[in-house]
């Protein structure tokens, strides 16, 4: 399964406004997650990409949390 296919984010930051403005700062290789509308990639190999979308929510984390690992 391609790393970029699942819309998820480990490093999401939001303003505390209602509604918020959230941005994912995860770096991914070669492409952004599947729900990203504006993806910027560095001219390197492999390309390092990040999504510059501003959303009103955070996607679920990609990595299971420590709590999830225990259960």
């Amino acid at each position: 399964d391609d790393e970029s296919s699942k819309p998820c984010c480990d490093q999401c930051a939001c303003t505390k406004s209602n509604p918020p403005q959230c941005r994912c700062s995860d770096m991914r290789l070669n492409s952004c997650h599947s729900a990203c509308k504006s993806c910027i990639c560095a001219l390197s190999y492999p390309a390092q990409c990040f999504c510059v979308d501003i959303t009103d929510f955070c996607y679920e984390p990609c990595k299971p949390s420590e709590d999830d690992k225990e259960n």
Partner: antibody, heavy 120, light 112 residues
């Protein structure tokens, strides 16, 4: 478990002030916003205002601007609502609630409410 | 201010029935970011309100799937597919798209 515990009922005289408290447990109030709302007898719900306890920033609804002051004390995980120059129109149940702004949800968890009665 | 109007004021139902509550806003409640911030709350007798639905159709955690929300623009509906005794109380819609944020006047769901 996220819980908000509010202070007890208040009976106050017209013209007086009152300060209500809302203490969080199971979460850190700095992580979200704390909102205050009220419900007057036989009436609907009304948003009063909110505070970001992480920095003390506040916002108020237009109807209670000047009457309500929201503060917080992060060391005790508590938010406060002070109401000044009370009249019988301010008789209501006052609720605090925490948002989950990153969902985004406005009023995710509510306190049990504090009844404020303004009477001579 | 955006006026939120709910209908009916009172809704008598039999347990197991479907219930439908309408909420209309006096103006379009699409936020400038393109999203619609319409929430539904249930206040049971003697309790504080509890969140059921956010952003028109998203169930909050722990809310049974018999609750569903839909709508757009100015017209919104909360449906309860099979009413249970624990669903009785007053339902409020709320809009967070335009300041000041406002609630509907409530719909009381009661036993027929």
């Amino acid at each position: 478990e996220v819980q908000l515990q509010q202070s007890g009922a208040e009976l106050v005289k017209p013209g007086a002030s009152v300060k209500l408290s809302c203490t969080g447990s199971g979460f850190n109030i700095k992580d979200n916003n704390i909102h205050w709302l009220r419900q007057r007898p036989e009436q609907g719900l009304e948003w009063i205002g909110k505070i970001d306890p992480a920095n003390g920033d506040t916002e108020y609804g237009p109807k209670l601007q000047g009457k309500a002051t929201i503060t917080s004390d992060t060391s005790s995980n508590t938010a406060y609502l002070q109401l000044n120059s009370l009249t019988s129109e301010d008789t209501a149940v006052y609720y605090c609630a925490t948002d989950l702004y990153s969902k985004p949800v406005w009023f995710a968890y509510w306190g049990q409410g504090t009844l404020v009665t303004v009477s001579a | 201010d955006v006026l939120m109007s709910q209908a009916p004021l009172s809704l008598p139902v039999s347990l197991g029935d479907q219930a439908s509550i309408s909420c209309r806003s006096s103006q379009n409640i699409v936020h400038s970011n393109g999203n619609t911030y319409l929430e539904w709350y249930l206040q049971k007798p003697g309790q504080s309100p509890k969140l059921l639905i956010y952003k028109v159709s998203n169930r909050f955690s722990g809310v049974p799937d018999r609750f569903s929300g839909r709508g757009s623009g100015t017209d919104f509906t909360l449906k309860i597919s099979r009413v249970e005794a624990e669903d009785l109380g007053v339902y409020y819609c709320f809009q967070g798209s335009h300041v000041p944020w406002t609630f509907g006047g409530g719909t009381k769901l009661e036993i027929k």
